[in-house]
Interface confidence: medium
């Protein structure tokens, strides 16, 4: 039946309870509440190995794996988000094998699609073909104008602009902490129909691309005197529950996948763009690296200098931003006003699943050994003809990879080398 085109059904997967509610349910049951108390004591100031060596701690963990706390999730921007995340990580930091490269997201999976946003964008703006209007118009300027026509968007945008532009002293450009907070409020409280249009507007020229880059007022919120090491920055981010959660969510929703046609997990552009926007206003704030209208490259403010023997891991971490075909395709698709339609004609299952922790590095997904696109291939990714191969250490695969070329940059014949990390 066509339904099986959609991928695996969710056998036995129950929709997650939010962690605040799960905590209340646990507190009402003496066995659960006492084990949860034990677990929190076990985790306080101890590493995982010490904790698991303690039989009482192990027993508490096993009992809690059967409770609603185990697969509880949080919603971005929910009333008690921080409390929810604290509860989530209090359980999950005890379950992971030390530092994971990719951590499972504490947030509920996103089921809405980009097409929903386009529909709303056209309602709000009164145009039928938003966000794509015409080749000549400056979409980023249009997005700012649209924001100003909405009271909530205008108020919160004005707020972050004034805070992030406020110079404290000749040596201190601005109050970065306050600027970040104002940005978080903007991206969490303003509907994505407005925020996405400002962040992901498509550009034909440098002036437009520079406006797009300036959206988050990078001189205050993004740039710094020096670029820290990316793994150090990730370490700092992971000490904060909110930042850690947003980064995990980005990886869960934007990690390049060889199993899907768009390179995005579950072919969901909307989930990836939402996760990207969710990182703005934290230590890991990403932004466009330059004012190039066509070559979309985003990155957090960090580099891999001084990584020592962790250079490969650092480069892999950075590539998830700078060379990520899922993220690039998602940004382009939004700019073009297109979404992928992967549902068959007929009944289908919503194949959303609780994100899994991934341990193995995967390869950049922009490897393709063909440039022939037939006679009328979909133009969603006009400048991107890509789909990668999986990480694998076999000699055969390495040879296969070094022979592949990409035509993401027109006229270039650059060979992308695979990661040689552990598989």
């Amino acid at each position: 039946s066509p339904s099986s085109l959609q991928g695996p059904e969710l056998h036995g997967w129950r929709p997650p309870v939010d962690c605040v509610r799960a905590n209340e349910l646990c507190a009402a049951e003496s066995n659960c509440s006492s084990r949860y108390r034990t677990l929190r004591q076990c985790l306080a100031g101890r590493d995982r190995n010490t904790m698991l060596a303690n039989k009482e701690c192990q027993a508490a963990l096993e009992v809690l794996q059967e409770s609603p706390l185990y697969d509880c999730r949080c919603k971005r921007g929910m009333k008690k988000e921080l409390q929810c995340l604290q509860i989530y990580w209090s359980i999950h930091l005890g379950l992971t094998e030390g530092e994971e490269f990719y951590e499972a997201s504490p947030y509920e999976p996103v089921t809405s699609r980009l097409s929903d946003i386009f529909r709303l964008a056209s309602i709000f703006s009164g145009t039928g073909a938003d966000p794509v209007v015409s080749a000549k118009s400056n979409h980023c300027l249009d997005a700012a104008k649209a924001c100003n026509l909405n009271d909530n968007c205008k108020k919160l945008r004005s707020s972050y602009i004034s805070i992030c532009n406020r110079e404290i002293s000749p040596t201190e450009r601005c109050n970065r902490r306050k600027c970040h907070k104002a940005l978080r409020q903007f991206f969490d409280r303003v509907p994505s129909e407005y925020t996405y249009r400002m962040l992901f507007c498509s550009c034909q020229d440098q002036a437009c691309a520079e406006r797009r880059r300036q959206t988050i007022l990078p001189s205050c919120s993004y740039e710094d005197k020096e670029k820290p090491n990316c793994l150090d920055l990730r370490g700092v981010c992971r000490t904060d529950h909110l930042c850690r959660s947003r980064l995990a969510d980005f990886h869960a929703n934007c990690r390049a996948s060889y199993q899907t046609v768009t390179s995005c997990p579950a072919d969901n552009y909307q989930a990836c763009l939402g996760s990207y926007a969710g990182m703005i206003g934290f230590d890991m704030t990403p932004n466009y690296v330059d004012s190039s209208p066509t070559g979309i490259v985003v990155s957090p403010w960090c580099s891999c200098r001084g990584s020592g023997n962790m250079e490969e891991e650092c480069e892999k971490f950075l590539r998830d931003f700078t060379e990520n075909p899922c993220l690039r395709n998602a940004i382009q698709a939004f700019g073009n006003g297109t979404d992928v339609n992967v549902s068959p004609k007929g009944p289908s299952f919503q194949a959303t699943q609780a994100p899994r922790v991934e341990k193995t590095p995967s390869l950049p997904d922009d490897l393709s050994d063909s440039t022939s696109l037939g006679t009328s291939v979909i133009t969603t990714c006009t400048s991107v003809q890509e789909q990668g191969l999986k990480a694998n250490n076999s000699k055969e695969l390495s040879m296969c990879f070094t022979e592949l070329t990409t035509n993401i940059i027109p006229g270039s014949n650059k060979v992308i080398k695979p990661n040689s990390g552990p598989s």
Partner: antibody
Framework: QVQLVQSGPEVKKPGASVKVSCKAS????????MHWVKQTPGQGLEWIGR????????NYNQIFKDRVTMTLDTSSSTAYMELSRLRSDDTAVYYC????????????WGQGTLVTVSS | DVVMTQSPLSLPVTLGQPASISCKSS???????????LNWLQQRPGQSPRRLIY???KLDSGVPDRFSGSGSGTDFTLKISRVEAEDVGVYYC?????????FGGGTKLEIK
């Protein structure tokens, strides 16, 4: 319902090329990879490669890489597989297969196209 | 390439009796996303292959529940609880975790 209909049998001379077509219906063509698989009595099933109808990207098995070209005509929901420099050991049934987001998750197969290479 | 080894090559079974086919891979098929891309195909005489099971144990719609799949890592098994006449054909395991994807050599199920 989902259907993959392939072109008819072909008889070719060694050194020639063959182009097999596969017309899809009953599902969103651009949402799922199209795979091509070779079947011979001696070698069993062999994966030739896949094409992504969403963006035209291809991944070919190294064994066939120098001789295979996969293309699309999305307006007619048709995929093509061309094999050049044919040899006698290319005599086989070629299947197109599609469905499922996932790499190995193929649940619809064409009826197969027999290609005979003979001098 | 990942080598998929199936056994036995031929499996004569009495109608109504159980049958079991083994498939071993030269590398673990657990993918980085936590899924194991191992499928079982059935090819009846003169027909195209048809997928019975995906992701190790999930039955495709329309597949009788006498079929079941199990295993993890490198060892997988297809079981038929009670063989029926329509089950005659060749069964293949097929991995989609590693590039290039590869098939087992096939197991021919026949009625005794």
């Amino acid at each position: 319902q989902v259907q993959l209909v392939q072109s008819g049998p072909e008889v070719k001379k060694p050194g020639a090329s063959v182009k097999v077509s596969c017309k899809a219906s009953g599902y969103t063509f651009t949402g799922y990879f199209m795979h091509w698989v070779k079947q011979t009595p001696g070698q069993g099933l062999e994966w030739i490669g896949r094409i992504n109808p969403y963006n035209g990207a291809t991944n070919y098995n190294q064994i066939f890489k120098d001789r295979v070209t996969m293309t699309l005509d999305t307006s007619s929901s048709t995929a093509y597989m061309e094999l050049s420099r044919l040899r006698s050991d290319d005599t086989a049934v070629y299947y197109c297969a599609s469905g499922g987001h996932y790499y190995g998750n193929v649940d619809y197969w064409g009826q197969g196209t027999l290609v005979t290479v003979s001098s | 390439d990942v080598v998929m080894t199936q056994s036995p090559l031929s499996l004569p079974v009495t109608l109504g009796q159980p049958a079991s086919i083994s498939c071993k891979s030269s590398q673990s098929l657990l993918d980085t996303d936590g899924k194991t891309y191992l499928n079982w195909l059935q090819q009846r005489p003169g027909q195209s292959p048809r997928r019975l099971i995906y992701l190790v144990s999930k039955l495709d719609s329309g597949v009788p529940d006498r079929f079941s799949g199990s295993g993890s890592g490198t060892d997988f098994t297809l079981k038929i609880s009670r063989v029926e006449a329509e089950d005659v054909g060749v069964y293949y395991c097929w991995q989609g975790t590693h590039f290039p994807q590869t098939f087992g050599g096939g197991t021919k199920l026949e009625i005794k």
